[in-house]
Amino acid sequence: QFLKEGQLAAGTCEVIAAHRDSSQPRRTIARQTARCACRKGQIAGTTRARPACVDARIIKTKQWCDMLPCLEGEGCDLLINRSGWTCTQPGGRIKTTTVS
């Protein structure tokens, strides 16, 4: 079973577009679009700060930290109303991700 050109292996993702906006002081807004080929019971999400296929039940319950979205060593916390999550680096810098 060989992959055709442009075909993703099951359970994997690739970034197809990225955009950064640094126009506001002390704040960078980054947007990323990914293409994923997820297995049954999975859905596109974020693991270790990269696009990944994750357990679909995580998205349903909005337990975003269950995707392991932060880098190892960072702390993950849910935003109020479960609208996203924050990753806190050991130095205290916080990266916020909102789900739209």
Partner: antibody, heavy 113, light 107 residues
Framework: QSLEESGGRLVTPGTPLTLTCTAS????????MNWVRQAPGKGLEWIGI?????TTYYAGWAKGRFTISKTSTTVDLKITSPTSEDTATYFC??????????WGPGTLVTVSL | ELDLTQTPPSLSASVGGTVTINCLAS??????LAWYQQKPGKPPTLLIS???NLESGVPPRFSGSGSGTDYTLTIGGVQAEDAATYFC?????????FGAGTNVEIK
């Protein structure tokens, strides 16, 4: 980075037993934590998994027989009513993508009268 | 529920020879397969994930291949220290499942 299990001992059938897994060098909340067991001279059996939120999933045969829970520093496995078939070495192991990259050395549970 | 049939249950190999262990899945697991080595009294250690990705520190004589329902672990140029039991593990969905194991003896 390492894992260590504790709490394994000789118990009589029906006496609940709790095993504990302690992590060193990494945060449990950054991984999915699993329990796997191995009866003497037999193969490996996955018991279940716990997510950072506390969500758990179990193998069909393990539902009702085991309970996985966690604190910020440990992951516990409770054997609710042990029988002789539960005699095994119990391992905790961590995953991110579904395969087990770090295992503890295991703790032996013997169920006997 | 996924079933993994591992063959052969045991085998004997000579130093320098080649060992092949097969793992047959009851359904397509989309390359979500890992291989472990276990020595007596020790926990398993991860050799290969994603069918063919060698873990850091694992000698290159170990290799994995396969797709769909058919997967293989190959040890080329077997060494005495490769005497162990080898397990395959599928992780395409829950429950996570192991093969029954293959005991490799080195002559």
């Amino acid at each position: 980075q390492s894992l260590e299990e504790s709490g394994g001992r000789l118990v009589t059938p029906g006496t609940p037993l709790t095993l504990t897994c302690t992590a060193s060098g990494f945060s449990l909340s950054s991984y999915y934590m699993n329990w796997v067991r191995q009866a003497p001279g037999k193969g490996l059996e996955w018991i279940g998994i716990i997510y950072p939120s506390g969500t758990t999933y179990y193998a069909g045969w393990a539902k009702g027989r085991f309970t996985i829970s966690k604190t910020s520093t440990t992951v516990d496995l409770k054997i609710t009513s042990p029988t002789s078939e539960d005699t095994a070495t119990y391992f905790c192991a961590r995953t991110v993508s579904g395969y087990f990259d770090i295992w503890g050395p295991g703790t032996l549970v013997t169920v006997s009268l | 529920e996924l079933d993994l049939t591992q063959t052969p249950p045991s085998l004997s190999a000579s130093v320098g020879g080649t060992v092949t262990i097969n793992c047959l899945a009851s359904e397509d697991i989309y390359s979500a397969l890992a291989w472990y080595q276990q020595k007596p009294g020790k926990p398993p250690t991860l050799l290969i994930s994603g069918t063919s990705n060698l873990e850091s520190g694992v000698p290159p004589r170990f290799s994995g291949s396969g797709s769909g329902t058919d997967y293989t672990l190959t040890i080329g140029g077997v060494q005495a220290e490769d005497a162990a039991t080898y397990f395959c593990q599928g992780y395409s969905s829950y429950p996570l499942t192991f093969g029954a194991g293959t005991n490799v003896e080195i002559k």
